[in-house]
Amino acid sequence: ARGTNVGRECCLEYFKGAIPISRLTRWYKTSGECPKDAIVFVTVQGKSICSDPKDKRVKKAVRYLQRTWKGGPQES
């Protein structure tokens, strides 16, 4: 079974632009079955944005969401 914060989708590439932190609603990791590790941020418009889990900006955005949502990972 998937963990509560593991998504069912895969990513081909990482988004290279600025992450719109204030417009993010949740995040999750892609499945281990995927060929590329990624963190997916979901925006208020429902867009899934693939991001590099090693990127400092990505880690910062995850921390922001964890604080915003009282620390818990969001269900995918």
Partner: antibody
Framework: QVQLQQSGPEVVRPGVSVKISCKGS????????MHWVKQSHAKSPEWIGV????????IYKQKFKDKATMTVDKSSSTAYMELARLTSEDSAIYYC?????????????????WGAGTTVTVSS | DIVLTQSPATLSVTPGDSVSLSCRAS??????LHWYQQKSHESPRLLIK???QSISGIPSRFSGSGSGTDFTLSINSVETEDFGMYFC?????????FGAGTKLELK
């Protein structure tokens, strides 16, 4: 207008390989991923996989991992798929189809533009 | 893999009829469901994305609804050019999968 132009039909012997092509035009080729879809006679489409037109990163459906190899040539805006060790089960129409940008997750993978299809017939 | 079950397999209608085509997913796929039309000897054509979002150039008689596991493509007043196969496709879970299709034919 946006078009995907595929290579012509192939009739090949069992056991050999075939490489089919898909040339994108009317849009920025590297802005969209390219998918490949198999459709056997009178059957529903079956997704083979998707390739990033930027990096060449690819995701394959498990059953096609040893059958299909997807590549891209950015300079000619062309995607390729090679099918190896062909058998009669591989006889089908193969479509390329344009997907959403690479950096969206797979929940955004639908196909808004399709090629006309390449018919591959495997016959001895 | 997520299985999409389409029903009915064949639908016989007269031009002017309004019809509903069903697509049922083996597990919840949110709204990540898309519809295609395929006429004989042609490539599939995208009709509806994300359950209900319209596509530029597609006639307004085509509409979609549903969520979770049950989805419907509706055609309001079928025209002769609408006959062919209709497929649903899910993008919620990798690998992407298609339904077996519904054939819309002339009664």
């Amino acid at each position: 207008q946006v078009q995907l132009q595929q290579s012509g039909p192939e009739v090949v012997r069992p056991g050999v390989s075939v490489k089919i092509s898909c040339k994108g035009s009317g849009y920025t080729f590297t802005d969209y991923a390219m998918h490949w879809v198999k459709q056997s006679h009178a059957k529903s489409p079956e997704w083979i996989g998707v390739i990033s037109t930027n990096s060449g990163n690819a995701i394959y459906k498990q059953k096609f991992k040893d059958k299909a190899t997807m590549t891209v040539d950015k300079s000619s805006s062309t995607a390729y798929m090679e099918l190896a060790r062909l058998t009669s089960e591989d006889s089908a129409i193969y479509y390329c189809a344009r997907g959403r940008p690479d950096y969206y997750g797979s929940s955004h993978w639908y196909f808004d533009v399709w090629g006309a299809g390449t018919t591959v017939t495997v016959s001895s | 893999d997520i299985v999409l079950t389409q029903s009915p397999a064949t639908l016989s209608v007269t031009p002017g009829d309004s019809v509903s085509l069903s697509c049922r997913a083996s597990q919840s796929i949110s709204n990540n469901l898309h519809w295609y039309q395929q006429k004989s000897h042609e490539s599939p054509r995208l009709l509806i994305k994300y359950t209900s979002q319209s596509i530029s150039g597609i006639p307004s008689r085509f509409s979609g609804s549903g969520s979770g596991t049950d989805f419907t493509l509706s055609i309001n007043s079928v025209e002769t050019e609408d006959f062919g196969m209709y497929f649903c496709q899910q993008s919620d879970s990798w690998p992407l999968t298609f339904g077996a299709g519904t054939k819309l034919e002339l009664k």
